[in-house]
């Protein structure tokens, strides 16, 4: 009897030990994971994060769709709606260059760097060549008439516009439109002015920054968060808190991301900080990620979202700050009347798009999202979508704008910048991070469940045996 009882008690004890060990392994395992993650996400030489941060291992592509104007004469003569037809994608590989001038500052636990710009055309991923022609708004004419509202200057400009045979619209190749061309009208301006114009001019051989970000050595909750941009904590483009540089650059976030978090990030493309909110769980190549999206609230008017009041910088075009879905970034573009929106004026007020025909906004194609691996905070997939528009206003001094009867926010192009973790990187990530965490979780569960089952089974058996013996 003793042998059997002893055996049952031993089994129950072993079960209890396994269960306790499984239970202990949960917080201890989490601590180990946290310790490893905290060590590996710090931005310093030798960590996984640093290696991928210096030079992204992911191929990033920027696709462009150009809005080809179908009725330029009609618009210019009768102030008709602008009929556009999007043409694209024209794809470039971007952000393939390693960060430059990387300097660690141990005093304040920051690392500073420059992000070099470069773009390589990818013909196989494009519908045409860089020599394709498009009818687009004349950037120089629209910008000059806005920058110089003075009547005298406009009369002078008008004579130069006429002399150069420039008009409200122009035909330009893709390469010219994106990366720059010498404008014939600006070439006649008799005082020093840059005669080169382009939506992204200058781009190649330039760099964004200097960025100074926290390296996470003193506090992992600050890793990758921007301390200063171009030596300042503010942008000087907006009033109040709108001017602040918040969060990271969206390439990564501090680890242990929660679904309830609002992820702040700064984008120099749109000259402001913005935020993303959790939308759904996504499985990306076997890695569970959180999909965060830019909500429509971020593009709302101050009437709908009072937090946006300081992004409304003028009263006329914005119809006394009631328009939404477009952001006037002229202050950030040397006074050029550049307006940023989501593609096809997604989430924008009807008054913005009522002057444009041929737009079809839809969330799936035109919204921005970030797929973030929550434990590391790494962005493993993203789609940054934005549209660049130019304001053109009537001018009774500039002949080619004289017949316009209303303001137009003219879409020039929209872009989709995407990056997805490669298969090899995903496999490595699964084995090094997800795999290990899953394995640890599995071991914890097995130990706990086997232990509990053993303990309960052996204790029941023991109790049954004892009751039989007593009888």
């Amino acid at each position: 009897g003793c042998d059997r009882n002893c055996g049952l008690i031993t089994g129950a004890v072993i079960g209890a030990v396994l269960a306790v060990f499984g239970g202990i392994l949960m917080p201890v395992g989490d601590m180990l994971i946290q310790k490893t993650i905290k060590k590996e996400v710090v931005l310093e030489e030798g960590t996984i994060a640093f290696k991928n941060w210096v030079k992204t291992g992911t191929e990033i592509y920027r696709q462009f769709w150009i809005f080809d104007v179908q009725n330029p004469q009609e618009v210019m003569m009768n102030s008709s709606n602008i009929q556009v037809k999007q043409r694209g994608p024209y794809t470039y590989r971007v952000r393939f260059l390693a960060k430059e001038n990387i300097t660690q500052d141990p005093k304040d636990n920051t690392v500073s760097f420059l992000q070099p710009n470069g773009a390589i055309f990818e013909p196989s991923l494009s519908v045409g060549t860089e020599a394709d022609n498009f009818t687009v708004l004349n950037l120089a004419v629209a910008a000059a008439s806005h920058i110089y509202p003075n009547p005298f200057v406009q009369v002078v400009l008008n004579s130069l516009i006429n002399k150069s045979k420039s008009s409200m619209f122009q035909v330009r190749t893709l390469r010219e439109l994106l990366w720059g061309y010498t404008d014939p009208f600006l070439s006649l301006v008799p005082y020093p002015v840059s005669t080169r114009v382009g939506m992204f001019y200058p781009y190649n051989n330039t760099a964004d920054g200097v960025y100074k970000v926290f390296n996470g050595k003193d506090s992992i909750s600050k890793v990758a968060i921007i301390d200063t941009y171009k030596g300042k904590r503010n942008l000087s483009y907006w009033e109040s808190y709108c001017d602040m540089i918040n969060g990271t650059d969206a390439a990564s976030f501090p680890p242990f991301v929660e679904k309830s978090q609002v992820l702040q990030f700064f984008s120099s493309d749109i000259c402001r900080s913005i935020y993303a909110v959790f939308e759904s769980d996504v499985n990306l190549k076997g890695i569970p990620v959180y999909r965060f999206v830019l909500p429509s609230k971020a593009f709302a008017s101050p009437v709908q979202n009072p937090d946006n009041h300081c992004f409304c910088t003028e009263k006329i075009i914005s119809k006394n700050c009631t328009s939404y879905g477009v952001l006037d970034i002229s202050k950030c573009k040397e006074g050029k009347p550049v307006y940023i929106s989501l593609p096809h004026f997604l989430y924008a007020s009807p008054d913005v798009s009522e002057t444009i025909d041929g737009l079809n906004p839809n969330e799936e194609e035109h919204r921005t999202y970030l797929d973030i691996e929550p434990i590391t905070g790494f962005t493993l997939q993203f789609a940054k979508r934005l549209q660049v528009n130019l304001l053109v206003k009537p001018s009774n001094k500039i002949q080619v704008l004289k017949r316009l009867k209303r303001n137009y926010i003219v879409p020039i192009l929209w872009l989709n910048e995407t990056g997805t973790i490669g298969d090899e990187k995903a496999k490595m990530f699964r084995s090094q991070v997800t795999g290990k965490i899953n394995l640890l979780g599995l071991i914890e569960m097995i130990l706990l469940s086997v232990g509990v089952v053993m303990f309960v089974a052996f204790m029941i058996s023991y109790c049954a045996c004892r009751s039989k013996t007593i009888k």
Epitope: N150, P151, V153, V155, N158, P190, Y191, N396
Partner: antibody, heavy 118, light 107 residues
Framework: EVQLQQSGPELVKPGASVKISCETS????????MHWVKQSHGKSLEWIGG????????KYNQKFKGKATLTVDKSSSTAYMELRSLTSEDSAVYYC???????????WGQGTLVTVSA | ETTVTQSPASLSMAIGEKVTIRCITS??????MNWYQQKPGEPPKLLIS???TLRPGVPSRFSSSGYGTDFVFTIENLLSEDVADYYC?????????FGGGTKLEIK
């Protein structure tokens, strides 16, 4: 309140030069064009030229090219017009006048009388 | 260069009467015509700017009309304080050009 204060009257000899000034206050000097207008005794007004202080862009009436030179000193918010090789034909009241955003010659100086006499 | 022909060169009207001054331009200037009043010993004063726009603070008895090459300036109900020289200015192109002026006197 926008004010344009011109320098006092000038009596000059034929062949000489004169530089008259127009000091402005009450507005952002660089954002508005400064024009100069000639009014001979009992006659109409003639536009001499204009200067946009922001970038120093000038435009002259062909008739006054070589006769008038327009300059500005941003630090003192002052516009200048130099007239050279003066003859009796140049005897007149010269006004500086400033644009407003969308309006020509919205504000005027009090005028400077230039008399060319041997 | 756009030349501006202003007529009449002078006119004498009774108080309370309606005054009409005309300017004709040598080229089409849309509605880029301005009207100025100059009293003796004073600089000109802008009354009406481009687009037949009455300037703030200017009495509503002053008005203008016209488009293209033919422009008319009107004073309804003439007052003694309206005695002055009146000039039109075309601002469509450079050089800016003034009309020859109209001397308005009271009968």
């Amino acid at each position: 309140e926008v004010q344009l204060q011109q320098s006092g009257p000038e009596l000059v000899k034929p062949g000489a030069s004169v530089k008259i000034s127009c000091e402005t206050s009450g507005h952002t000097f660089t954002e508005y064009t400064m024009h100069w207008v000639k009014q001979s005794h009992g006659k109409s007004l003639e536009w001499i030229g204009g200067i946009y202080p922001n970038n120093g862009a000038t435009k002259y009436n062909q008739k006054f090219k070589g006769k008038a030179t327009l300059t500005v000193d941003k630090s003192s918010s002052t516009a200048y017009m130099e007239l050279r090789s003066l003859t009796s034909e140049d005897s007149a009241v010269y006004y500086c006048a400033r644009d407003r955003y969308d309006v020509w010659f919205a504000y005027w100086g009090q005028g400077t009388l230039v008399t060319v006499s041997a | 260069e756009t030349t501006v022909t202003q007529s009449p060169a002078s006119l004498s009207m009774a108080i309370g009467e309606k005054v009409t001054i005309r300017c004709i331009t040598s080229t089409d200037i849309d509605d880029d015509m301005n009207w100025y009043q100059q009293k003796p010993g004073e600089p000109p004063k802008l009354l009406i700017s481009e687009g037949n726009t009455l300037r703030p603070g200017v009495p509503s008895r002053f008005s203008s009309s016209g488009y293209g090459t033919d422009f008319v300036f009107t004073i309804e109900n003439l007052l003694s304080e309206d005695v002055a020289d009146y000039y039109c200015l075309q601002s469509d192109n450079l050089p800016l050009t003034f009309g020859g002026g109209t001397k308005l006197e009271i009968k």
